[in-house]
């Protein structure tokens, strides 16, 4: 008669942990003829160290059900059994769950903390932001995101085998030109007959597309680059400037900025 | 990250022999079984035969019983495939891949090609 | 032997379609069957282990199911980089065996 009353035992402690090495045996009641060989469901290329015994090394958190069989003449299989590894959390991930489209300043913003996967079940999460704890909820929420806002968020989450991080997420806002301000250079007192540069400094993202250059009289000139250069530059040219940015989020405008052109000592001398 | 390098493939005539080598690196090489699988020009894909992770139990495809032997030195991370009294239909691409928790191969190598021919 | 037998074994298909790749085991094998995609002149890369759990790495819009003698894999949305063939592989006893392999083409 076949082996009688065939089981797969697991000789471990629980629970398993992923990474263990995981020892089965193959146990049977009575058997005639003699058992005299095991087989084992699924095949793992697994180490036999001697009849009957299967060991795993550096158990994967997959393993699911192991059957053995003892066979004579005839082989019978065993109920299988399921290792119920115990693993940490797996493929954590940020995920922008609000807005759906593009964040732009001002907008409320929703990060979910995904996994796929965690044994045991429990978990805690924990959000970073060049490493420093900003929650420990599975979502991040900001009601009204600002530029200062963006950066490399990071999300945890832990159960009582250990913790994963997701890869770092980079929050990107947009918003409209902003801290515009004229720099001049090589100053704001310029001599006539020389040169002078007007710069539209500014923050925006995306970066301004273009620019607007404006005189004391709230005319519009004709130049549409960030640099605004006066060359020669003369008397007629004094007064107050401001520049208009924009980028596809809208426009933002700088405070005025005095520009003054005195004489040269030529032109003194004549007079 | 896991890296696996074929070696040694080439041309021999039937009768002849030739060891394959898989050189391993980015995961810790003992802890891993491992497998050759091969392919024939335009077929599909057959598997050779596989090691447990410390060497001691090995396992084969009736068609190489008795001609091919696998090995690994853990010293060196390296698989090795010998192969003895070749045929023309061992002709193929022979890749190394490594064993996942059971036999399912997570990383292969890029392959290396043998030719059996007169 | 278990024989594992893929259909259909080439298909002709357009981006964006939903494709289906069945794998029938000779035998019941449980869950212990893979998938794996092969891009031509590269080594098979590994997509679904245990019937279905997705491979790390591995998009979403590969999905298997099955379990005993009928397996599927499934790509929900066609994209043009899963061009190649797909290879169904039981691991229940040895040999280990692959199906026949399904090409896939763009129409």
């Known amino acids: 008669y076949p082996p009688k009353k065939v089981t797969t035992v697991i000789q471990n402690p629980m629970p398993i942990r992923e990474g263990d090495t995981v020892t089965l045996s193959c146990n049977y009641n009575s058997s005639n003829p003699s058992v005299t060989r095991y087989e084992w469901k699924p095949h793992g290329a697994w180490e036999e160290p001697s009849l009957g015994v299967l060991k795993i090394q550096n158990v994967g958190w997959d393993n699911t059900t192991i059957a053995c069989a003892a066979c004579n003449s005839w082989c019978s299989w065993a109920s299988p059994v399921a290792l119920n590894v115990q693993y940490a959390p797996r493929d954590v991930r940020v995920r922008k769950i609000k807005p759906l489209s593009e964040i732009h300043s001002g907008n409320s913003v929703s990060l979910q903390c995904d996994f796929s996967s965690s044994h045991p079940k429990e978990v805690q999460f924990f959000w970073e932001k060049n490493g420093r704890l900003l929650g420990k909820e599975s979502q991040l929420n900001f009601d009204s995101i600002s530029p200062e806002d963006a950066g490399s968020y990071s999300c945890w989450v832990n159960n009582s085998i250990g913790q994963t991080a997701s890869k770092a997420w980079t929050l990107e806002v947009l918003y409209a030109p902003r801290r515009l301000r004229v720099s001049m250079s090589p100053g704001d007192q310029v001599m006539e007959g020389k040169s002078a540069t007007l710069t539209c400094e500014s923050d925006a993202n995306p970066p301004v597309s273009h620019y607007t250059w404006f005189d004391w009289n709230n005319q519009s000139l004709p130049y549409h680059s960030q640099k605004l250069r006066l060359e020669p530059v003369k008397v007629q040219h004094s007064g107050a400037y401001w520049c208009q940015g924009t980028n596809s989020v809208g426009k933002g405008r700088s405070p005025l900025s005095t520009l003054t052109v005195y004489y040269s000592p030529e032109t003194i001398g004549r007079r | 990250q896991v890296q696996l390098v074929e070696s040694g493939g080439g041309l021999v005539q039937p009768g002849g022999s030739l060891r394959l080598s898989c050189a391993a690196s980015?995961?810790?090489?003992?802890?891993?079984?491992m497998s050759w699988v091969r392919q024939a020009p335009g077929k599909g894909l057959e598997w050779v035969s596989s090691?447990?992770?410390?060497?001691?139990?090995?396992y084969y495809a009736d068609s190489v019983k008795g001609r091919f032997t696998i090995s690994r030195d853990t010293s060196k991370n390296t698989l090795y495939l010998q192969m003895n009294s070749l045929r023309a239909e061992d002709t193929a691409v022979y890749y190394c891949?490594?064993?996942?928790?059971?036999?399912?191969?997570?990383?292969w190598g890029q392959g290396t090609l043998v030719t059996v021919s007169s | 032997d278990i024989q594992l037998t893929q259909s259909p074994s080439s298909l002709s298909t357009s981006v964006g379609d939903r494709v289906t790749i069945t794998c029938q085991a000779s035998?019941?094998?449980?869950?212990?069957l893979n998938w794996y995609q092969q891009k031509p002149g590269k080594a098979p890369n590994l997509l679904i282990y245990?019937?279905?759990n997705l491979q790390t790495g591995v998009p979403s819009r590969f999905s298997g199911r099955g379990s005993g003698t009928d397996f599927t894999l499934t790509i929900s949305s066609l994209q043009p980089e899963d061009i190649a063939t797909y290879y169904c592989?039981?691991?229940?006893?040895?040999?280990?065996?692959f199906g026949q392999g399904t090409r896939l083409e763009i129409k």
């Open positions: 891949a490594r064993y996942g928790s059971a036999a399912w191969m997570d990383s």
């Open positions: 980015g995961f810790t090489f003992s802890n891993y079984a």
């Open positions: 090691i447990s992770g410390s060497g001691g139990s090995t």
């Open positions: 035998h019941d094998i449980r869950n212990y």
């Open positions: 245990a019937a279905s």
């Open positions: 592989q039981q691991y229940d006893g040895l040999p280990l065996t």
